[in-house]
Interface confidence: low
């Protein structure tokens, strides 16, 4: 019977998750006389195979980061090896899984901020990359501050934009940072994929050293 897994030779598109060890055939093409065998060409990468009887399958896990689409062609041949049908395009779309970790571009960042700077105004960006598809949660990154040292009165002086990695002062930081009291701070920043929303997300951390500089501008006396 013809159905999801079998049918005549025609252009088709299949979606397969990367990383999936082979666990089913892709399709069984049915030969119409005088066709007796099938031939596969294109971007097979020695992964995609078609048996003479028309059974199309793959023999090892796909990797989207190596090739996100495999463009194949299938032709039906007669007993003399002459193409009698096709070749028709068969497209394999490789769907993304979360198989790559986000990685900070630097293991250590350094920056400076002037005391009394406007809260929310970025003075430093941390940046991470993830090879997974950014159009899926697998490649969507979420930045956060894990530790601020020193932490005075349990008050956070720094904040980070969870999506962009932009570091800026909080309202308290803008008001209270004083290089005479504490000229430097260290932040540990983490980045998670899956938009930070999954216990299965991967993460990375980086260190940020921040120097607080004196605000040399003085308000004019009345």
């Amino acid at each position: 019977q013809e159905g999801k897994f079998s049918g005549p030779l025609k252009p088709m598109t299949f979606s397969i998750y990367e990383g999936q060890e082979p666990s089913q055939i892709i399709f069984q093409f049915k030969a119409n006389p005088p066709a007796v065998t099938f031939e596969l060409t294109g971007e097979t990468d020695n992964i995609f195979v078609i048996e003479r009887e028309g059974l199309l399958y793959y023999n090892r896990a796909l990797d989207r980061e190596t090739r996100s689409t495999h463009n194949l062609q299938v032709a039906a041949l007669d007993a003399n090896g002459i193409i009698v049908e096709g070749p028709v395009p068969i497209t394999i779309k490789v769907k993304d899984i979360n198989d790559n970790r986000p990685t900070f571009l630097q293991s250590k960042y350094e920056g400076s901020v002037r005391q009394n700077s406007r809260p929310g105004k970025p003075f430093l960006y941390v940046n991470a990359t993830d090879l997974d598809d950014p159009a899926t949660p697998n490649g969507q990154l979420y930045y956060q501050i894990v530790i601020q040292l020193p932490m005075i009165n349990n008050v956070m002086y720094f904040q980070i934009n969870n999506k962009t990695g932009a570091i800026s002062l909080t309202r308290e930081g803008s008001q209270e940072l004083n290089p005479a009291k504490n000229p430097s701070y260290n932040l540990v920043i983490s980045v998670k994929d899956m938009g930070g929303q999954s216990e299965n997300s991967f993460s990375d951390t980086t260190s940020v050293d921040i120097i607080v500089t004196e605000n040399i501008w003085k308000a004019p006396k009345p």
Partner: antibody, heavy 118, light 106 residues
Framework: EVQLQQSGPELVKPGASVKISCKAS????????MHWVKQSHGKSLEWIGY????????GYNQKFKNKATLTVDSSSSTAYMELRSLTSEDSAVYYC???????????WGQGTSVTVSS | QIVLTQSPAIMSASPGEKVTMTCSAS?????MHWYQQKPGTSPKRWIY???KLASGVPARFSGSGSGTSYSLTISSMEAEDAGTYYC?????????FGGGTKLEIK
């Protein structure tokens, strides 16, 4: 809690058939493929085949192609394996095991012992 | 089919001892999976995707390897680790298991 509850032990005569069941609970049945594995007494494991999670397509180890038939009833979250033309070589413990493409067979049934004897 | 050969077939280790068992594949495979089985019970997923520990598996276990050579290591043997360990490949049909390594406590 994920559970795979298999039917009880079977004592059958040579040449007969037997149908083993594996009832799943604690997860969405159609999200996972169900595999079947044979373990002869004191021996290693042999993969029989699997039934694809939501449409009944199945794949077999060629060795068992004419021995086992795998079916599924999604409405009752139950997978079945029928063994036919039984001989003493088929006496073994048969396991069902849940499988997702990432991460091997993570939950196994308790096993069903099949003894073929006249 | 891909044949998985486990060695040794039987081994014993004292508590605290480091244990390594190997699994050799007749052809290159993508990942190796390992199961633990104790007498009278079902196999349990132990290590999957070559090196990932299944839920509840102690951190003293580790898995490694690539191509045709894989291994399971216990950094410090404990009595509860005794059992039979099977390697398993799903990279090529038919899926196959190794003959098992029976690990006993001295």
């Amino acid at each position: 809690e994920v559970q795979l509850q298999q039917s009880g032990p079977e004592l059958v005569k040579p040449g007969a058939s037997v149908k083993i069941s594996c009832k799943a609970s604690g997860y969405t049945f159609t999200d996972y493929n169900m595999h079947w594995v044979k373990q002869s007494h004191g021996k290693s494991l042999e993969w029989i085949g699997y039934i694809y999670r939501n449409n009944g397509y199945n794949g077999y180890n060629q060795k068992f192609k004419n021995k086992a038939t795998l079916t599924v009833d999604s409405s009752s979250s139950t997978a079945y394996m029928e063994l036919r033309s039984l001989t003493s070589e088929d006496s073994a413990v048969y396991y069902c095991a849940r499988n997702y493409w990432r991460g091997a067979m993570d939950y196994w049934g308790q096993g069903t012992s099949v003894t073929v004897s006249s | 089919q891909i044949v998985l050969t486990q060695s040794p077939a039987i081994m014993s280790a004292s508590p605290g001892e480091k244990v390594t068992m190997t699994c050799s594949a007749s052809s290159s495979i993508s990942y190796m999976h390992w199961y633990q089985q104790k007498p009278g019970t079902s196999p349990k997923r132990w290590i999957y995707d070559t090196s990932k520990l299944a839920s509840g598996v102690p951190a003293r276990f580790s898995g490694s390897g690539s191509g045709t050579s894989y291994s399971l290591t216990i950094s410090s043997m404990e009595a509860e680790d005794a059992g039979t360990y099977y390697c398993h490949q799903r990279s090529s049909y038919p899926w196959t298991f190794g003959g098992g390594t029976k690990l006993e406590i001295k």
